[in-house]
Interface confidence: low
């Protein structure tokens, strides 16, 4: 609450996060033309990335384009991309939607469709929907430990959200354990009024707000965090503005002295930890 | 404008960026002692990295050191590094400029020059100039979509820079479309009075400032962002303070059971999105 | 100092860091059942990661699990994990401490111990102590160059911590060179009253605070940074809250068409650069 006689100072904050959990992923795997069910285990090294600062990312879904090599090939026949003759293809043209640079030739993509040939990582990425349900939907049960160290330099005061009295096997709950800093990802979504299973398909951004309203006067000292959660990406966003949260990354390798890559389009939840508040002192 | 009767509150912000574009790179490639022109395509997975938060990086140039292996070799003969006898080389010495630890022996680097032998990733990185013009100079035509969600917790007010009425095929222009949040990289530089082609060689840091000056009173409500651009690195910086923007990263692999790496010195533009402003309410 | 007649404005900041240094690492390497001493060199591409923003990470220690493959195997026999019959093992169970999903069978881990079989990356990670002393303890002698550009938009004032008059071969010292922005990592720890050699084993978080107290009035203009250092992680933290600073990442590769990975548990120092302060003008 506002105490007008106090000197207020904004918080200086440092955050450290640690995600825990294992996901079992079942997906169709094609090898040598044969498709079969593949089971694999994803642990933290597989679904999260060594990221600094006030964000962490948990991959909840993905689309893989394996064995790509730099060469010429027909581009993917998305809406409006088909051609019937070379006239439709412009040498040197880069369509922002395409994944390569046109050679000027119209070539067969499959038995029924022709598209412009491109210089690209081939075969080009298929523009298929993200798998539904999400492959790592069980990430809902992962937990994240959030450590937050704060400082009011003008008041020469430092504290942290984890106190020595706390129990490392707790789970945050708004009513029963509002000071526990281990959060189940599904609970974060529930608190924010969002459906994890749904968001996991396309990805999204979730804000974890840590509010420190600190009274540093010795006679009424109080300085503990309050956690709240809200979704930061726009779930009603128009397709042209790239809804959800995804990025592409590649694993490069050599096969028979040819550089190849596996392209992964990773969908997931980026969690932004937004720390704010003030310290007031007479 | 300052309304002294209002309660002002700083903005809490979350940013999400999405870069689009393809670059065609032409460079000399040496294989089996034969040098020929190589053409390759770089897409987002090749030139940018899955990075969190208020920054994104676009690689505009690079120098590769391929097939490095941990062993002993002569260090690179940069200025002042040549030797004529073992006396000039100090066992265990690590020159901050060097890439390894000296063994104490002076060995031939090539037919005309000798340098101190080092234990290092060999052959050591050649200290050659960044290619000019920059290999990915066409990154000037890449675009970035910036999504910014802001919150004034004290006023319980949230908004974002992208409105439902916006057109996903727009491009930001200071006069004609100042609310469009899709920016052409070259335009950002032009607005900041900088030359993209020049900066792309050594790299640099560009600030995209998003200023929210929000009047949250219902009778004169206004809350839209204003974008401005300024270069953040010092273009007149002394050589000793590492001008431009670059970092090294490695791709590791095994060949005949020997661990090897390709070292990439990546030059590029780091874009920092700096969100600031206040929300005022009676 | 507070000048009540001034209009104060918080600082907008951008940071760029550059770490320099080489570490020689000596460790036991086992190949074909034979253990011998291995020496390797780590340079910036090996011990740091291309990270944006106000943080950088220096790896000081690690534990490797090489040649892991997705299959079934006994889990690591940590405290409380041993079994004598299948009844102790629950099909589908994921122990948060474990690295896989139980199959329901109790199988031999070695000649004397049995543990529950899991579907996981196998062999599962051994839960051994971080090496002591730390493998990259010589990181104490690495240096970091910190470039900081600041802006007070309301006052239309920009400056940076590195001035043209500065000498690129300086090293920060609180008394002799308090404006030099090249810091020896060991000195940062000494200033903060911490022991680098000790922290390097488990990792930790170190804050580098840059305080700008700027008087922008022309008649008494002053705007230079003041550097201070403090440890941000809790060194007295209970085991359950994951003391120190570490994360796991993987290097994936194929061998005889089988996907494998090397898992690295990287311990190290995350340096957070915390920039704060105000610009005041009449």
């Amino acid at each position: 609450s506002d105490k007008l006689y106090q000197r207020k100072e904004p918080v200086i904050s440092s955050v450290h996060t640690k995600v825990k959990g294992i996901a079992e992923v079942t997906e169709n795997v094609t090898e040598g033309g044969v498709t079969k069910l593949g089971h694999s285990i994803f642990d933290t090294a597989d679904y999260t990335f060594p990221l600094q600062g006030n964000s962490f990312f948990v991959m909840t879904n993905y689309v893989k384009s394996e064995g790509q090599v730099q060469t010429l090939c027909p581009e993917y026949p998305r809406r409006g991309a088909q051609c019937s003759s070379d006239r439709r293809c412009k040498k040197g043209w880069m369509d922002p939607q395409s994944k390569g640079i046109q050679t000027g030739r119209c070539v067969p993509y499959d038995k029924t469709r022709k598209t412009c040939e491109v210089s690209a990582w081939c075969p080009t990425e298929e523009e298929k929907e993200a798998p539904r349900p999400a492959l790592l939907r069980s990430a809902e049960n992962f937990t994240v430990l959030i450590k937050n160290n704060i400082h009011f330099p003008g008041h020469n005061y430092t504290t942290r959200n984890i106190l020595p009295t706390m129990n490392g096997s707790c789970t945050f709950h708004k009513t029963w354990d509002p000071q526990c800093s281990i959060f189940r990802l599904g609970d974060i979504f529930q608190e924010a009024g969002e459906n994890f299973t749904e968001v996991a398909v396309q990805g999204g951004i979730m804000g974890i707000e840590i509010y420190w309203d600190c009274n540093l006067d010795s006679w009424s000292h109080h300085c503990r965090p309050r956690y709240s959660f809200r979704r930061l990406d726009d779930k009603n966003m128009d397709e042209s503005f790239v809804p959800g949260y995804n990025f592409r990354y590649a694993k490069y390798y050599k096969e028979n002295n040819v550089e190849k890559r596996t392209l992964i389009k990773a969908f997931g939840i980026r969690f932004d930890i937004l720390v704010f508040g003030t310290g007031g002192k007479f | 404008s300052d309304k002294l009767y209002q309660r002002k509150e700083p903005v809490i912000s979350s940013v999400h960026t999405k870069v689009k574009g393809i670059a065609e790179v032409t460079e000399n490639v040496t294989e089996g002692g034969v040098t020929k022109l190589g053409h390759s395509i770089f897409d987002t997975a090749d030139y940018t990295f899955p990075l969190q938060g208020n920054s994104f990086f676009v690689m505009t140039n690079y120098v590769k050191s391929e097939g490095q292996v941990q062993t002993l070799c002569p260090e690179y003969p940069r200025r002042g590094a040549q030797c004529s006898s073992d006396r000039r080389c100090k066992k265990g010495w690590m020159d901050p400029q060097s890439k390894g630890i000296q063994t104490g022996r002076c060995v031939p680097y090539d037919k005309t020059r000798k340098t101190c032998e080092v234990s290092a990733w060999c052959p050591t990185e050649e200290e050659k100039e960044a290619p000019r013009p920059a290999l990915l100079r066409s990154a000037e035509n890449f675009t970035v979509l910036i999504k910014n969600n802001i919150h004034f917790p004290g006023h319980n007010y949230t908004t974002r820079n992208i409105l439902p009425t916006m057109n996903g095929s727009c491009t930001f222009h200071k006069t004609w479309d100042p609310q469009c949040s899709i920016f052409r990289l070259g335009d950002i530089f032009q607005e900041a009075g900088e030359n993209f082609t020049e900066v792309a060689v050594q790299g640099g840091i560009m600030g995209i400032e998003i200023y929210w000056d929000c009047n949250l009173d219902s009778w004169s409500h206004h809350c839209r962002p204003r974008y401005s651009f300024r270069r953040l690195d010092d273009k007149n910086m002394d050589e000793s303070f590492v001008p431009g923007y670059n970092f090294r990263y490695a791709k590791y692999y095994k060949e005949n059971n020997v661990e090897k790496r390709t070292l990439i010195k990546a030059f590029g533009i780091r874009f920092d999105i700096l969100v600031f402003g206040t929300g005022g309410k009676f | 100092s507070d000048k009540l007649y001034q209009r104060k404005e918080p600082v907008i900041s951008s940071v760029h860091t550059k770490v320099k240094g080489i570490a020689e690492v000596t460790e036991n390497v086992t190949e074909g059942g034979v253990t011998k001493l291995g020496h390797s060199i780590f340079d910036t591409a090996d011990y740091t990661f291309p990270l944006q923003g106000n943080s950088f990470f220096v790896m000081t220690n690690y534990v490797k699990s090489e040649g892991q493959v997705q299959t079934l195997c006994p889990e690591y026999p940590r405290r409380g994990a041993q079994c004598s019959s299948d009844r102790r093992c629950k099909k589908g169970w994921m122990d948060p401490q474990s690295k896989g999903i139980q199959t329901g069978r109790c199988v031999p881990y070695d000649k004397t111990r049995k543990t529950c079989e899991v579907s996981a990356w196998c062999p599962t990670e051994e839960e051994k102590e971080a090496p002591r002393p730390a493998l990259l303890r010589s990181a104490e002698n690495f240096t970091v160059l910190i470039k900081n550009n600041i802006h007070f938009p309301g006052h239309n004032y920009t400056t940076r911590n590195i001035l043209p008059t500065m000498n690129g071969s300086c090293t920060f010292h609180k008394t002799w060179d308090p404006q030099c922005s090249i810091f020896r990592l060991g000195d940062i720890f000494q200033e903060a009253g911490e022991n680098f050699t000790e922290v390097a084993v488990q990792g930790g978080i170190m804050g580098i605070e840059i305080y700008w107290d700027c008087n922008l009035d022309s008649w008494s203009h002053h705007c230079r940074p003041r550097y201070s250092f403090r440890r941000l992680d809790d060194k007295n933290m209970d085991e359950s809250f994951v003391p120190g600073y570490n994360f796991r990442y993987a290097k994936y590769y194929k061998e005889n068409n089988v996907e494998k990975r090397t898992l690295i548990k990287a311990f190290g120092i995350r340096f957070d650069i915390l920039v704060f302060g105000t610009g005041g003008k009449f």
Epitope: T26, R137 | - | K91, G92, W93
Partner: nanobody, 127 residues
Framework: KVQLVESGGGLVQAGGSLRLSCAAS????????MGWFRQAPGKLREFVAS????????RYIDSVEGRFTISRDNTKNTLYLQMNNLRAEDTAVYYC????????????????????YGQGTQVTVSS
């Protein structure tokens, strides 16, 4: 709204077998864990068996482990419970439910983690 319809109950002698089915309509339940619960006269509803969304993992109450087998056919949106070697104490109304969470691995046996829509099917085991 999901509708769950149980079938396959009946009167059987001790040591006999029954196969219960639960057909889901209204939406696909293949994304959810599913479970069987039972309620004997004058007793609370109790967990019997549960299966995760993929059908790979199953859980049972100790008293039915080895005698009952839960399975599902996601293509048919159907859940099954094969009950062998039935005992008198298995007499109850059996309900099919789908798991809403949180955390199937920890909470598969907690009735409050499920949504119940079925009317139930009576199983009576005579001795």
């Amino acid at each position: 709204k999901v509708q769950l319809v149980e079938s396959g109950g009946g009167l059987v002698q001790a040591g006999g077998s029954l196969r219960l089915s639960c057909a889901a309509s209204g939406r696909t339940v293949s994304d959810y864990g599913m479970g069987w619960f039972r309620q004997a006269p004058g007793k609370l509803r109790e967990f019997v068996a549960s299966i995760n969304w993929s059908g790979i993992y199953t859980r049972y109450i100790d008293s039915v482990e080895g005698r009952f087998t839960i399975s599902r056919d996601n293509t048919k949106n159907t859940l099954y419970l094969q009950m062998n070697n039935l005992r008198a104490e298995d007499t109850a109304v059996y309900y099919c439910a789908y798991f809403l969470g949180p955390n199937w691995y920890s909470n598969y046996g907690r009735p409050s983690s499920y949504d119940f829509y079925g009317q139930g099917t009576q199983v009576t085991v005579s001795s």
